[in-house]
């Protein structure tokens, strides 16, 4: 066998994108590799060029259609292959039978905005992006708030165990700058994982009212 270890991981965004990462120890950075997608019950097939993202890791996106088109369902199986060029021929490196709705990772939530802010509270809303209508309300969210002098890793996670696209942050400090992020995960799928974190939303609480003399 080829020496070292390799890893091939793909996720479906629930609409029209399968994102894949291929890594192999000892593989040359300029190796030319592709991912080929062959659905079992669709007339299309798709290929993407793996591009380096780190020392021994490559990634690409299989674009299956327009961003909000529903290209796959829970009964689909897509056979995914990693093929790398060796001289004049292509060599198979990995094959996976991929069930899209068992391997979900949604796009990061978008359109974060402050609905209302007070001295100690802030109400924030967001939207999910390119998420399948199949989920109906079967989604959950995690959120975190960055306080001054702390890192994102130190921020406690707040869990919303339902499809709730808003949150009311409480016990905040007046006249203080904060940042807020949220991510989403469908309840479905054995290998489903959290979306990336949203872009941070910066906000400032209102100053406390001056006390009367």
């Amino acid at each position: 066998a080829v020496n070292g270890t390799s890893r091939f991981t793909c996720f479906y965004n629930s609409r029209a994108n399968i994102s894949c990462v291929w890594s192999q120890d000892g593989a040359l950075q300029d190796t030319s590799c592709q991912v080929h997608a062959w659905p079992d019950r669709r007339r299309w097939n798709q290929t993407c060029e793996l591009l380096p993202v780190s020392q021994a890791s490559w990634a690409c996106n299989l674009i299956l259609g327009t961003p909000d088109s529903q290209k796959l369902t829970a009964v689909d199986i897509v056979t995914l292959r990693v093929m790398c060029r060796e001289g004049v021929r292509w060599r198979m490196m990995a094959i996976q039978d991929f069930k899209p709705f068992e391997n979900l990772r949604l796009m990061a939530p978008i359109s974060l905005q402050v609905v209302h802010v007070e001295t100690h509270r802030c109400n924030i809303s967001w939207k999910i992006s390119q998420a399948s209508h199949y989920f109906e309300r079967h989604l959950e969210f995690e959120a975190r708030t960055l306080s001054p002098g702390h890192t994102w890793e130190e921020a406690p996670l707040m869990t919303l165990k339902q499809k709730q696209e808003w949150i009311c942050l409480e016990t905040l400090t007046p006249d203080t700058q904060y940042e807020f992020q949220v991510r989403v995960k469908p309840l479905q799928g054995e290998f489903t994982t959290w979306s990336p974190w949203s872009q941070p939303l910066a906000f400032r609480t209102k100053p406390a009212a001056l006390g009367k003399d």
Partner: nanobody, 121 residues
Framework: EVQLVESGGGLVQAGDSLRISCAAS????????MGWFRQAPGKETEFVAG????????HYADSVKGRFTISRDNAKNTMHLQMNNLKPEDTALYYC??????????????WGQGTQVTVAS
């Protein structure tokens, strides 16, 4: 507990056929690709053949293509490797392996103990 158990190995003459098998626990068999690797004395472990769990897509090493056939019996949680026109260079310890992917690297998640195949000239 994950268990992969190979059987069917033995001593044969060059040009003969042999079928080796691998029995797997149910959860592994229904959710993982299965494959065969082999290791000859003093040599590195070599990918032989693999088969995916849903579409039964197969892949073979160039050295066995056209001579070996991998198959799986989902009803019995068993995988087989039919080896025809065996050659002395096919002599090795044959391992069954399971992983989410067929990979040509020998870092699959689960492994059996191996069954010895010896081809005499």
């Amino acid at each position: 507990e994950v268990q992969l158990v190979e059987s069917g190995g033995g001593l044969v003459q060059a040009g003969d056929s042999l079928r080796i098998s691998c029995a797997a626990s149910g959860r592994i068999f229904s959710n993982y690709a299965m494959g065969w690797f082999r290791q000859a004395p003093g040599k590195e472990t070599e990918f032989v053949a693999g088969i995916t769990h849903l579409t039964s897509t197969t892949h073979y090493a160039d050295s066995v293509k056209g001579r070996f056939t991998i198959s799986r019996d989902n009803a019995k949680n068993t995988m087989h490797l039919q080896m025809n026109n065996l050659k002395p260079e096919d002599t090795a310890l044959y391992y069954c392996a399971a992983d989410r992917n067929i990979k040509i690297t020998a870092d699959w998640s689960y492994w059996g103990q191996g069954t010895q195949v010896t081809v005499a000239s």
